[in-house]
């Protein structure tokens, strides 16, 4: 890949943020430059991700600022790595009945989670909210992403196509806005009026379907109420 400004890459229009959402808050998964993975209450340059969909529901998740792949070790710890290991850095994506997404390691079976507990994914399970994710379009001005495009690092000296056999770093445009009918708040479990607990209107849209296929006839996702 040429060492050009990332702003010239078409994929930069497809940056997304994965976030967990409860009725009151949300945390965005971020991959720091040192490989530490945690959650932030807001979009940050380290929570801007590229998600490449592969066959059979597998995805590869890359932090664009850290230039690290989201990976998981055998204990279920998630971390960012410059090196792509297909066993550790590919995740099975599944959309739950509630429209939220879960990601788990096909190798170790643990869920990707922003909580500290490590839990294996079992079909039909209802994971805790900090293991369920939604996607939002990037809202951070691209000028803040003043870094080279992430690339796969390997010890070998093969050409770029060998270093990126899954074409992770040039993801196809697969971000589809949710239908207008989806842009509504979920009814609050506590309040009679959605505005009652959100008088400042802090819950706003921008969620997108980051993977091929919808969750229903209209591809709608839940609209979480968070601040």
């Amino acid at each position: 890949y040429p060492n050009a400004s990332p702003l010239l890459g078409s994929s930069w229009g497809g940056l997304i943020h994965l976030y967990t959402a409860t009725a009151r808050n949300s945390y965005h998964l971020q991959i720091h430059k040192n490989g530490h993975v945690d959650g932030a209450p807001h979009q940050t340059i380290y929570s801007a991700l590229m998600i490449r969909s592969e066959d059979a529901g597998f995805v590869v998740i890359t932090g664009v600022m850290s230039r690290r792949y989201l990976c998981m070790d055998f204990r279920g710890n998630i971390f960012g790595s410059h090196y792509f290991d297909p066993e550790n850095c590919r995740f099975q994506h599944q959309t739950l009945e509630n429209g939220y997404d879960v990601y788990h390691s096909p190798q170790y079976h643990f869920l990707v989670s922003l909580g500290r507990a490590k839990r294996a994914f079992l079909p039909g399970m209802n994971p805790p909210p900090y293991s369920q994710f939604l996607s939002r379009r990037n809202e951070i001005p691209l000028i803040h992403f003043n870094t080279p495009i992430p690339r796969r690092h390997t010890q070998s000296a093969e050409d770029d196509s060998e270093r990126d056999p899954l074409n992770v770093l040039k993801p196809r445009a697969r971000m589809t806005p949710a239908p207008a009918s989806c842009s509504q708040e979920l009814p609050s479990a506590e309040d009679n009026s959605p505005m009652a607990s959100d008088p400042l209107g802090v819950v706003r849209g921008g969620r997108v379907n980051t993977h091929a296929g919808g969750t229903g006839p209209e591809g709608c996702r839940p609209f979480a109420k968070f601040i």
């Epitope: 967990t20 409860t22 009725a23 009151r24 808050n25 945390y27 945690d38 959650g39 932030a40 209450p41 807001h42 922003l114 909580g115 500290r116 507990a117 839990r119 209802n126 994971p127 805790p128 909210p129 900090y130 479990a189 506590e190 400042l200 802090v202 601040i227």
Partner: antibody
Framework: QVQLVQSGAEVKKPGASVKVSCKAS????????MHWVRQAPGQGLEWMGI????????SNAQKFQGRVTMTRDTSTSTVYMELSSLRSEDTAVYYC??????????WGQGTMVTVSS | AIQLTQSPSSLSASVGDRVTITCRAS??????LVWYQQKPGKAPKLLIY???FLESGVPSRFSGSGSGTDFTLTISSLQPEDFATYYC????????FGPGTKVDIK
């Protein structure tokens, strides 16, 4: 080390307002939501609301709608909780608590607010 | 909103006893439940997160179990410093607390 240090005890008249502060240190202030929880004498814990430290957006329990205002000052890593139209049943210890996604891991020492005529 | 109930509301026990406290949610909350210990005049202290995971620094005599709607906090061998009030809290929807269980000396 993480510390949440709250302002001192207050005595207020019914109908007045009180503003409690919570100064955070030992971590990146903007990376964690902050909550307010209160506890009336001899009673249990009651969640009041949450503030996003970077945007200042808040969300409150319905019970406190219109009476509680949560703010923050990022320059001093401090969050504030103001409760208005005080009544005797607002007499309680008020705590701030840091959210770490799956729990409240650090709590302030508590601020006793007494409402009495 | 999801309601949490705890039982018993209070119990008397002796040092060395095995103590079990239950917390029930009005609807399923997966494993998004935590347990706190609170002593008089002090802020709550986190014991268990995600229903069954021990917080760092908490003695191993404390354990948690359960998923969905029914949860349990167990103290395998009660120590003098364990006499306190214990609260559950759910993180699935809002942040409601249980009413508490007071453990005092028999």
């Amino acid at each position: 080390q993480v510390q949440l240090v709250q302002s001192g005890a207050e005595v207020k008249k019914p109908g007045a307002s009180v503003k409690v502060s919570c100064k955070a240190s030992g971590y990146t202030f903007t990376n964690h939501y902050m909550h307010w929880v209160r506890q009336a004498p001899g009673q249990g814990l009651e969640w009041m609301g949450i503030i996003n430290p970077i945007s200042g957006s808040t969300s409150n329990a319905q019970k406190f709608q219109g009476r509680v205002t949560m703010t923050r000052d990022t320059s001093t890593s401090t969050v504030y909780m103001e409760l208005s139209s005080l009544r005797s049943e607002d007499t309680a210890v008020y705590y701030c608590a840091r959210d770490i996604v799956d729990a409240f891991d650090f709590w302030g020492q508590g601020t006793m607010v007494t409402v009495s005529s | 909103a999801i309601q949490l109930t705890q039982s018993p509301s209070s119990l008397s026990a002796s040092v060395g006893d095995r103590v079990t406290i239950t917390c029930r949610a009005s609807q399923g909350i997966s494993s998004a439940l935590v347990w706190y210990q609170q002593k008089p005049g002090k802020a709550p202290k986190l014991l268990i997160y995600d229903a069954s995971f021990l917080e760092s620094g908490v003695p191993s005599r404390f354990s948690g179990s359960g998923s969905g709607t029914d949860f349990t906090l167990t103290i395998s061998s009660l120590q003098p410093e364990d006499f306190a009030t214990y609260y559950c809290q759910q993180f699935n929807d809002y942040f409601t607390f249980g009413p508490g269980t007071k453990v005092d000396i028999k």
